[in-house]
């Protein structure tokens, strides 16, 4: 359903936001060497790309309404 889809997207966005902050905090405590700067840039870009990837891939996964029903129809009550 749309609610489930929105919930899943929200979860992923929240997860990525938390992961980005954690990675940035860890890197900011590292000495500002050229390597550290490059690493921080890579992580920032990487999570930004992951966010973009999720927003596109979300449309490719089958939505929940088009997956397997909980009960096979042959065991359901006749209409």
């Amino acid at each position: 359903s749309e609610a489930e889809d929105a919930s899943l997207l929200s979860f992923m966005q929240g997860y990525m936001k938390h992961a980005t902050k954690t990675a940035k905090d860890a890197l900011s405590s590292v000495q500002e060497s050229q390597v550290a700067q490059q690493a921080r840039g890579w992580v920032t870009d990487g999570f930004s790309s992951l966010k973009d990837y999720w927003s596109t891939v979300k449309d490719k996964f089958s939505e929940f309404w088009d997956l397997d029903p909980e009960v096979r129809p042959t065991s359901a009550v006749a209409a």
Partner: antibody
Framework: QLQLVESGGGLVQPGGSLRLSCAAS????????MRWVRQVPRKALEWVSS????????AYRDSVKGRFTISRDNAKNTLYLQMNNLKPEDTAIYYC???????WGQGTQVTVSS | DVVLTQTPGSLSVVPGESASISCKAG???????????LYWLLQKPGQSPQRLIY???NRDSGVPDRFTGSGSGTDFTLKISGVKVEDAGVYYC?????????FGQGTKLEIK
């Protein structure tokens, strides 16, 4: 017992239209998402379209988007596929299928040729 | 689109022997809900396809236990132990994890 019976197929010229129907019985039709799947002459199976239980959600393969419309009437236990601007490559046997591929109709032949 | 590659394209088996069909997916078939929507279907001559296995390894009711589905991620297998004459037909794997939903090209099982 459960039955899915397709109808509405036939021979049509390119650019023409057809409306396929699938009469469902033997189960609570309104509680199951449905699909149309076709089998082209070389025997390959292709998913065509899906529709949610209330008809609010629909999905189509790219090659039929804008030409085909899936719909359902839960009061009549019937699934539909309106096919417009038909092309020779739409020639196939069209099957009505319950989501998850658990049950299939016998199929209806659609031939698009001049 | 997720390509499903089945091998072999055809096989001929003596009744009583085992048969194995492979299905390789171009992408990991695990859905965000944690389930893997990989199916095995059989189409007997002149009939509509029928589902044998759903979600990789679950046999449909009425399907003999000689049919076994296994695998994960991108590699899946259908094994038929002690093949019977009535098992002849074309076997398809199918995925429902992604749109568009796709099918393998089929494996024709012939009984010698």
């Amino acid at each position: 017992q459960l039955q899915l019976v397709e109808s509405g197929g036939g021979l049509v010229q390119p650019g023409g239209s057809l409306r396929l129907s699938c009469a469902a019985s033997g189960f609570t039709f309104g509680t199951y998402s449905m699909r149309w799947v076709r089998q082209v002459p070389r025997k390959a199976l292709e998913w065509v379209s899906s529709i949610s239980t209330d008809g609010g959600g629909t999905a189509y393969r790219d090659s039929v988007k804008g030409r085909f419309t899936i719909s359902r009437d839960n009061a009549k236990n019937t699934l539909y596929l309106q096919m417009n601007n038909l092309k020779p490559e739409d020639t196939a046997i069209y099957y009505c299928v319950i989501a998850g591929y658990s049950d299939w109709g016998q199929g209806t032949q659609v031939t698009v040729s001049s | 689109d997720v390509v499903l590659t089945q091998t072999p394209g055809s096989l001929s088996v003596v009744p009583g022997e085992s048969a194995s069909i492979s299905c390789k997916a171009g992408q990991n078939l695990v859905h965000p809900d944690g389930k893997t929507y990989l199916y095995w279907l059989l189409q007997k001559p002149g009939q509509s396809p029928q589902r044998l296995i759903y979600q990789v390894s679950n046999r449909d009711s009425g399907v003999p236990d000689r049919f076994t589905g296994s695998g994960s991620g991108t590699d899946f297998t259908l094994k038929i132990s002690g093949v019977k004459v009535e098992d002849a037909g074309v076997y398809y794997c199918a995925q429902g994890t992604y749109w568009p939903k796709t099918f393998g090209q089929g494996t024709k099982l012939e009984i010698k």
